[in-house]
């Protein structure tokens, strides 16, 4: 009769996570009597996975009914694999001993590899707004995949992207895997509906990549351009003067005018216009009485957009291109919220 | 602890059934195999053959083609039928537990009846 | 078939050492269980697994196995212990047992 061989049939096994991996073995013979244990790894540090003798195992059951006299099928199913299962597994056969089982043969071993998909990846954009003409980083993670080749793009508005770095840690052999990327993005006056997309592609995801996204709305900052005009109104002593704010982003913004570097009025964007680009146009405007004046008068359109520096414009009235009238009220009439006298 | 009781006709002609019952009494069924042994008057023990609570057998190779074991796990019951008995089935039949122990192969008769007394005769 | 061949009887003083063999084929690769059975009664289980005892069985029956024979040692051998010893073990998916041996206590 043959000496007893333990067979592992399978050098390797390939499983999805959550899944169950079925380890295989037989023996050749029921000779020597003894359990079957199965250990993840070799050597001193080896981790018992299953012992047919003794021991409670909830994520392992047999492929046969053990109990039967004549069983020589000693495969085990592990349920509800993680990556953290990976690695190689030994069946060993052990005959009785006195007072402890002795270790007897051992099969070569099934190296157990798990698919892990990757996390949903996440992008992350810079801290503080940016203007356009500027270059800004973003970030994209995904953690947890195995095994570790992975393929990751860069997309702004459906264009790939080509300025870009990444790094999947760690370097050597591990459970799984995580990948790191920084793209750098040059920005446009027209991005504020733009988005910058992360793809991340892996063989756990069977052709469908994940996709993480930023809208550059939430990066831009776009300043505005300042108009200020005058034209006549009601009256020849009447002036309208109008401050066009065009073309910025976020609409955070507060508008100060000023009489001859003296705050007239402030008032805050409410009622803005957007533009197709997803960038706002604002207008505010005074009602001068020129009679009220005897010099020219300076005028100044000052904005204040999302907390940044102020910019303004400024726009002279020529006082003496419209002569006052003697004993003319100087009580100019307020006609509405953006409408201002000079008095 | 577990007990257990058999009965069974003890008296039979030539060519007819024996056919003997064993109860379990306090103990689990399941888990473990149930054996049934004779021994022929002053002679040794002879196993006849195994059967565990899913109906799984194994038998004695020179008996199996004239043994049938049952079981009936609703009563905690497991039984013998030796068809076509001759004066040379003539013994002491004794039915056993197979102790599974910690390891479920290979393990020793560790609970036995007290045996039945069965007797062919013409 | 594996076959168990076992002396018919031994023979032992009270207080001595008496040593019942029991022999087959690769035997020390088998577990090997033995019973006693007094007359009258049924077989009881003195050893199992080779060499461990089950509860309540007196300290001075010990077993071994090896090679192609076990053995059942009953140290300090006493008047109760007169009965047949058998021996057995597995072949595949049967039991066997061993022809029985007598132990006599003078």
């Known amino acids: 009769e043959e000496e007893l061989q333990v067979i592992q049939p399978d050098k390797s096994v390939l499983v999805a996570a959550g899944e169950t991996a079925t380890l295989r073995c037989t023996a050749t013979s029921l000779i020597p009597v003894g359990p079957i244990q199965w250990f993840r790894g070799a050597g001193p540090g080896r981790e018992l996975i299953y012992n047919q003798k003794e021991g409670h195992f909830p994520r392992v059951t047999t492929v046969s009914d053990l109990t039967k006299r004549n069983n020589m099928d000693f495969s085990i199913r592990i349920g509800n694999i993680t990556p953290a299962d990976a690695g190689t597994y030994y069946c060993v056969k052990f005959r009785k001993g006195s007072p402890d089982d002795v270790e007897f043969k051992s099969g070569a071993g099934t190296e157990l590899s798990v698919r892990a998909k990757p996390s949903a990846p996440v992008v992350s954009g810079p801290a503080a707004r940016a203007t356009p003409q500027h270059t800004v980083s973003f970030t994209c993670e995904s953690h947890g995949f195995s095994p570790r080749d992975i393929t990751l793009k860069w997309f702004k508005n459906g264009n790939e992207l080509s300025d870009f770095q990444t790094n999947v840690d760690p370097v050597g052999e591990s459970v799984s895997y995580s990948i790191h990327s920084t793209a750098k993005v040059v920005l446009t006056r027209e991005d504020v509906h733009s988005q910058v997309i992360c793809e991340v592609a892996h063989v756990t995801l069977q052709g469908d990549p994940l996709r993480g996204t930023a809208n550059l709305s939430e990066t831009i900052r776009v300043p505005p351009t300042l108009e200020v005009t005058q034209q006549p109104v009601r009256a020849e002593n009447q002036v309208n003067v109008t401050c066009q704010v065009r073309k910025f982003y976020p609409q955070r913004l507060q508008l100060t005018w000023l009489e001859n570097g003296n705050v007239s009025r402030t008032e805050t964007a409410s009622t803005v216009t957007e533009n197709k680009d997803g960038t706002y146009n604002w207008m505010s405007w005074l009602l001068v009485n020129v009679s009220a004046h005897r010099d020219d008068v300076k005028l100044t359109c000052q904005v204040e957009h999302d907390g940044q520096p102020a910019v303004s414009k400024s726009h002279d009235l020529k006082v003496s291109a419209h002569p006052k009238e003697q004993g003319s009220n100087t009580a100019a009439e307020n006609t509405g919220s953006n409408e201002r006298n000079i008095y | 602890q577990v007990q257990l009781q058999q009965w069974g006709a003890g008296l039979l002609k030539p060519s007819e059934t024996l056919s003997l019952t064993c109860a379990v009494y306090?103990?689990?069924?399941?888990?473990?195999?149930w054996s049934w042994i004779r021994q022929p008057p002053g002679k040794g023990l002879e196993w006849i053959g195994e059967i565990n609570h899913s109906g799984s057998t194994n038998f004695n190779p020179s008996l199996k083609s004239r043994v049938t074991i049952s079981v009936d796990t609703s009563k905690n019951q497991f039984s013998l039928k030796l068809r076509s008995v001759t004066a040379a089935d003539t013994a002491v039949y004794y039915c056993?537990?197979?102790?599974?122990?910690?390891?479920?192969?290979?393990?020793?008769?560790?609970?036995w009846g007290q045996g039945t007394t069965v007797t062919v005769s013409s | 078939s594996s076959e168990l061949t076992q002396p018919p009887s031994v023979s032992v003083s009270p207080g001595q050492t008496a040593s019942i063999t029991c022999s087959g084929d690769?035997?020390?690769?088998?577990?090997v269980y033995w019973y006693q059975q007094k007359p009258g009664q049924s077989p009881v289980l003195v050893i199992y697994h080779d060499d461990r005892r089950p509860a309540g069985i007196p300290e001075r029956f010990a077993g071994s196995a090896s090679g192609n024979t076990a053995t059942l040692t009953i140290s300090g051998t006493q008047a109760m212990d007169e009965a047949d010893y058998y021996c057995?073990?597995?072949?595949?998916?049967?039991?066997?047992f061993g022809g029985g041996t007598k132990l006599t206590v003078l």
């Open positions: 056993s537990r197979v102790d599974s122990g910690s390891y479920p192969y290979y393990d020793g008769l560790d609970v």
């Open positions: 306090g103990g689990s069924f399941s888990g473990y195999y």
């Open positions: 690769k035997l020390g690769d088998k577990y």
């Open positions: 057995q073990t597995w072949d595949s998916s049967t039991v066997v």
